[in-house]
Interface confidence: low
Amino acid sequence: AITEAREEAKPYPLFPGPFPGSLQTDHTPLLSLPHASGYQPALMFSPTQPGRPHTGNVAIPQVTSVESKPLPPLAFKHTVGHIILSEHKGVKFNCSISVPNIYQDTTISWWKDGKELLGAHHAITQFYPDDEVTAIIASFSITSVQRSDNGSYICKMKINNEEIVSDPIYIEVQGLPHFTKQPESMNVTRNTAFNLTCQAVGPPEPVNIFWVQNSSRVNEQPEKSPSVLTVPGLTEMAVFSCEAHNDKGLTVSKGVQINIKAIPSPPTEVSIRNSTAHSILISWVPGFDGYSPFRNCSIQVKEADPLSNGSVMIFNTSALPHLYQIKQLQALANYSIGVSCMNEIGWSAVSPWILASTTEGAPSVAPLNVTVFLNESSDNVDIRWMKPPTKQQDGELVGYRISHVWQSAGISKELLEEVGQNGSRARISVQVHNATCTVRIAAVTRGGVGPFSDPVKIFIPAHGWVDYAPSSTPAPGNADPVLII
């Protein structure tokens, strides 16, 4: 509830004698603030006695009348010095001065806090001529005052290049407290202290602050604004606000939520974007971050084959861009993939596991133990080998590709043979005698052709030679294949 202090009016004439004009407010300004402690505003309306000399700027005219009487000093008459009123009320205040009729074209300007109020639509100047002097009354009115109307107002008049300045009229607009700093939403670590700040201003001052947590006041005593609330720590989310009180009532700040940082929720919607023989590209939708930014994520990969040893491969990556290419996978294999992400508090649970498969690839190794020998009786070269290990076939074998290159003086001829996957031997016709035949073999799957084996060379003699020993791939460590004839 907003409490509005009762306003009292004590109007009195501003201009003694024949001059019209008095202080006017639509609802009359607050002249005294009722308060049990006896507080009264420091500055009150203080009318002066008629004829009291002016303390501000005066102009002493040099002109004298026909009788050579010197004219009295020109000065604005005293008026109210301090007007206190509530926001949105109306106020009217005046400056008055009596100017000898010998002066023409006198104008009064209004100034606020040292700046002229140009074209101020609320200013009216009235002239009341008499035999010798003209009473000039400048009125300034504001229909609905706001805080921005607070300040010091003066009148100025120029005569004979002299400036006459009135005493200031201080306008003090009072209202409910106005927040200059409100608490901010925060994400905090459980059971860790943090501060919230609240600041509000009047007038009227003082402004007292009460803190509210989840609709209950926190501090037993009101604190003068500004106030810093140190919360020793929270175990669950809370909403804080502050109440600012002054003699006009109370204003409540926005409520701010203080969240407790927690481990994130697991990622959701892990999906396969692309699959190759040895890699899988996945993406995921991050879960709730637990009021703390994600730092990184962990991709966990395990073979789905029930016969596998169940070991888990872990790949760490940055939290963004929620995309990761898992590499070094086996071809034509099934994997279970889960994703977990972490923030400063800890790791989330693993996402629901998804199944993914790599595609068939070209074999990663060549056939082993390639042996070549010449069968002269049939004029053929016999080739034998061992198939690559199953794990390194990277797919289902569909056959082999044999490259045989024939070289003799000035001639080089390469031929390719495709053989079926059954068996591990082949026979090729001798293409050239008195030449060297170099043989290489590669395994083939639907995924492509694998690497060729190291070359094995055999010399094919001219007709009539008797004894031929086989050639084979070298034992590990030998630099070149050995040709035995």
Epitope: N219, E220, P222
Partner: antibody
């Protein structure tokens, strides 16, 4: 059911001591501020002091009339609030009530649950 | 300390009547005021808090109003169970203080 039951009242000579107890049940005793209020015969209620909750370290606050003579304490494991009264005077006579601040209410506080009261008479 | 002044100190009324008890604070306490009812030989019971919010289980014939320094408790259509003493209490800051009480008697 939320319940507060005071005990320990009786007749004591001026200058003497007395300890009152307030057994709490039906709510989480450690979460609430707890207070003592007294009522002299035929007179108004007077707040004596309170014990803040566990989150605020069970710290205490006293009225000027009893500060230095009365001490409020708690046994949180038994859910009992105590009022230790020393240097008793005739004007300390009356019915003593323990009362509970509303849950999670940390202000000067109103009292939503009251005990049945126990009578203290200080007389020679 | 903030002084709470209750009036009247006592009043007589008949069943079915409407009565109003007032409470004045020595300074602005905004809406931080509670009302209690106490029957003879019993402990006080909370009726109203935050100046106008009825406590749980309090009949709607009770109503609180006011803010700042002036507060009142109104009881419409008095019932036999309503007779007893009534106290106001501020909780704007420590120490919380009670009014002197109003004794409501059957006429």
């Amino acid at each position: 059911e939320v319940k507060l039951v005071e005990s320990g009242g009786g007749l004591v000579q001026p200058g003497g001591s007395l300890s009152l107890s307030c057994a709490a049940s039906g709510f989480t005793f450690t979460d609430n501020y707890m207070t003592w209020v007294r009522q002299p015969p035929g007179k108004a209620l007077e707040w004596l002091g309170f014990s803040r909750n566990k989150a605020n370290g069970y710290t205490t606050e006293y009225s000027a009339s009893v500060k230095g003579r009365f001490t409020i304490s708690r046994d949180s494991s038994q859910s009992i609030l105590y009022l230790q009264m020393n240097a008793l005077r005739a004007e300390d006579s009356g019915t003593y009530y323990c009362a509970r601040f509303p849950p999670h209410y940390y202000a000067g506080g109103y009292f939503d649950v009251w005990g049945t009261g126990t009578t203290v008479t200080v007389s020679s | 300390d903030i002084q709470m002044t209750q009036s009247p100190a006592s009043l007589s009324a008949s069943v079915g009547e409407t009565v109003t008890i007032t409470c004045r604070a020595s300074e602005n306490i905004y809406s931080y005021l509670a009302w209690y009812q106490q029957k003879q030989g019993k402990s006080p019971q909370l009726l109203v808090y935050n100046a106008k919010t009825l406590a749980e289980g309090v009949p709607s014939r009770f109503s609180g109003s006011g803010s700042g320094t002036q507060f009142s408790l109104k009881i419409n259509s008095l019932q036999p169970a309503d007779f007893g003493s009534y106290y106001c209490q501020h909780y704007y800051r420590t120490p919380p203080t009670f009014g002197g009480g109003t004794k409501l008697e059957i006429k």
